[in-house]
Interface confidence: low
């Protein structure tokens, strides 16, 4: 018996074929003997079967012995044994009907789980693997769980249904809803304006939510709502501002925030939640800001930054083309009776200057300018 | 914006081993597949392959067993080599970036290619 | 592998012209499919993605559609610096593949 794998909602053409190569009578019934379609000369005809308005047969090929019935709009209980008679013959051909599906939502959070779930005929033992975008493999029956999902899990999943040595293959898109990066970090000079940028990792048609910038600066004891603001279609507008700092916000996408000035008293971590709407959770996006002032107070020449710095940054006093005459992994340096010239305060990563401040130091009876 | 750009020797002898390097800057290599494509000159072009992580790739099967791809993601590049070359492989070779997501995909930045001789 | 055959091969069309350049697949692909220009001595440019959807920056005279086998690229008013060659390529399975082009030329 010839096995045929169909996939709900699609079309199935089952072949019967006739040695004689032109129109002769035939006709197909399910197993319950029940005649579904066949032909009367040039005419086809339908049977009382259930499949009776999703049945169907390719005249054009009747000529060439050549007798298809083709299901329309494949249901999993249209899953059952097909006998096609002609020329005295009988062929049967099993057909069995899958679906699958994302039982929630196909746009879900970032860090949530997606479960597929398997439709299939009572009697069957399909196996089923999926590929993720990013060639993940999953495995397993009925139900598929994938935990955690990451943003490169965003696209088409593959998935491959195994049942009598013949396979199906289902294709289900998955959005991720995600900023595309979960934390970055600014650096800037005191009084340098800030711009913080939040750009999503997904395109939907319309996007409606509410979000809010959590500060927790490095100088306070706790954190605060520095602004909210709500997304309609894509438009922002903004609902509430602190006064300090008084935030400036984008009305378009990506979200866009401006801070008119780095000042120390900023400098820290801020957490933007964006809640989107009919979806449980909240998108995440972390920020941070590092801020560095370059001083020069009697004869003290110091360097300060303020905010969260690795261990592993080096920050450094030195006199322009000249070698560094102070570095250290700390948050402050100085330097004792600095010679006159234009020194430099360099924050670096491995070699990799992240900030820049430059002093001017006067001989000593004058004060000094900052550039 | 994202720019690519090959390097590599552009003569190598026949029977030695091609290889080529994608340097990606103005981004990062995580979280996309890159792919190689080559176009031998006046035809048309031909999928390599391409990799994700150093453990996910994915070879055209005609190149497979002489095709090696990795990836360096603290150098941003990623390469290509291909062992046992002939006179067939003489190709404009170019590395992409491939873009999946909802609803879309496709290649959607390019090195400028870098013409590869085989010869002796 | 999935065989991608496009056509025509190559052809002639005066500026303003509305041009039309056929893929066919092997085997149904749904709607996994681009175009790709690629002028004299440059890299392929990604025009169109997912069959029908205008890659960002495209000029909106560049249109596809198409779904299962049978795909059309159009070209709604040829301008000059359209001449060049254009591929289609599938991504409904690996590998990759891409038709043999088209050469466009103005008349």
């Known amino acids: 018996k010839k096995v045929v794998l169909g996939k709900k909602g699609d079309t199935v053409e089952l072949t019967c074929t006739a040695s004689q190569k032109k129109s002769i009578q035939f006709h197909w019934k399910n197993s319950n003997q029940i005649k579904i379609l066949g032909n009367q000369g040039s005419f086809l005809t339908k049977g009382p079967s259930k499949l009776n308005d999703r049945a169907d047969s390719r005249r054009s090929l009747w000529d060439q012995g050549n007798f298809p019935l083709i299901i329309k709009n494949l249901k999993i209980e249209d899953s059952d044994t097909y006998i096609c008679e002609v020329e005295d013959q009988k062929e049967e051909v099993q057909l069995l009907v899958f679906g699958l599906t994302a039982n929630s939502d196909t746009h879900l959070l970032q860090g949530q789980s997606l479960t597929l779930t398997l439709e299939s005929p009572p009697g069957s033992s399909p196996s089923v693997q999926c590929r993720s975008p990013r060639g993940k493999n999953i495995q397993g029956g009925k139900t598929l769980s994938v935990s955690q999902l990451e943003l490169q899990d965003s696209g088409t999943w593959t998935c491959t249904v195994l049942q009598n040595q013949k396979k199906v293959e289902f294709k289900i898109d998955i959005v991720v809803l995600a900023f595309q990066k979960a934390s970055s970090i600014v650096y800037k000079k005191e009084g340098e304006q800030v711009e913080f940028s939040f750009p999503l990792a997904f395109t939907v048609e319309k996007l409606t939510g509410s979000g809010e910038l959590w500060w927790q600066a490095e100088r306070a004891s706790s954190s605060k709502s520095w602004i909210t603001f709500d997304l309609k279609n894509k438009e922002v507008s903004v609902k509430r501002v602190t006064q300090d700092p008084k935030l400036q916000m984008g009305k378009k996408l990506p979200l866009h925030l401006t801070l008119p000035q780095a000042l120390p008293q900023y400098a820290g971590s801020g957490n933007l939640t964006l809640a989107l709407e009919a979806k449980t959770g909240k998108l995440h996006q972390e920020v941070n800001l590092v801020v560095m002032r370059a001083t020069q107070l009697q004869k003290n020449l110091t360097c300060e930054v303020w905010g969260p710095t690795s261990p592993k940054l080096m920050l450094s006093l030195k006199l322009e083309n000249k070698e560094a005459k102070v570095s250290k992994r700390e948050k402050a340096v100085w330097v004792l009776n600095p010679e006159a010239g234009m020194w430099q305060c360099l924050l670096s990563d491995s070699g990799q200057v992240l900030l820049e401040s430059n002093i001017k130091v006067l001989p000593t009876w004058s004060t000094p300018v900052q550039p | 914006q994202v720019q690519l750009q090959e390097s590599g020797p552009g003569l190598v002898k026949p029977s030695e081993t091609l290889s080529l390097t994608c340097t990606v800057s103005g981004g990062s290599i995580s979280g996309f597949y890159w792919s190689w494509i080559r176009q031998p000159a006046g035809k048309g072009l031909e999928w390599i392959g391409r990799?994700?992580?150093?453990?996910?790739?994915n070879y055209n099967p005609s190149l497979k067993s002489r095709v090696t791809m990795s990836v360096d993601t603290s150098k941003n590049q990623f390469s290509l080599k291909l062992s046992s070359v002939t006179a067939a492989d003489t190709a404009v070779y170019y590395c992409?970036?491939?873009?999946?997501?909802?609803?879309?995909?496709?290649?959607?930045?390019w090195g400028q290619g870098t013409t590869v001789t085989v010869s002796s | 592998d999935i065989q991608m055959t496009q056509s025509p091969s190559s052809l002639s069309a005066s500026v303003g012209d509305r041009v039309t350049i056929t893929c066919q697949a092997s085997q149904d692909i749904s709607n996994y499919l681009n175009w790709y220009q690629q002028k004299p001595g440059k890299a392929p440019k990604l025009l169109i993605y997912a069959a029908s959807n205008l890659e960002t920056g495209v000029p909106s005279r560049f249109s596809g559609s198409g779904s299962g086998t049978d795909f059309t690229f159009t070209i709604s008013s040829l301008q000059p610096e359209d001449i060049a060659t254009y591929y289609c390529?599938?991504?409904?399975?690996?590998?990759?593949?891409f038709g043999q082009g088209t050469r466009l030329e103005i008349k």
């Open positions: 390529q599938q991504y409904d399975s690996l590998p990759i593949t």
């Open positions: 990799i994700y992580t150093s453990e996910n790739t």
């Open positions: 992409a970036r491939d873009r999946e997501g909802y609803y879309y995909y496709g290649m959607d930045v």
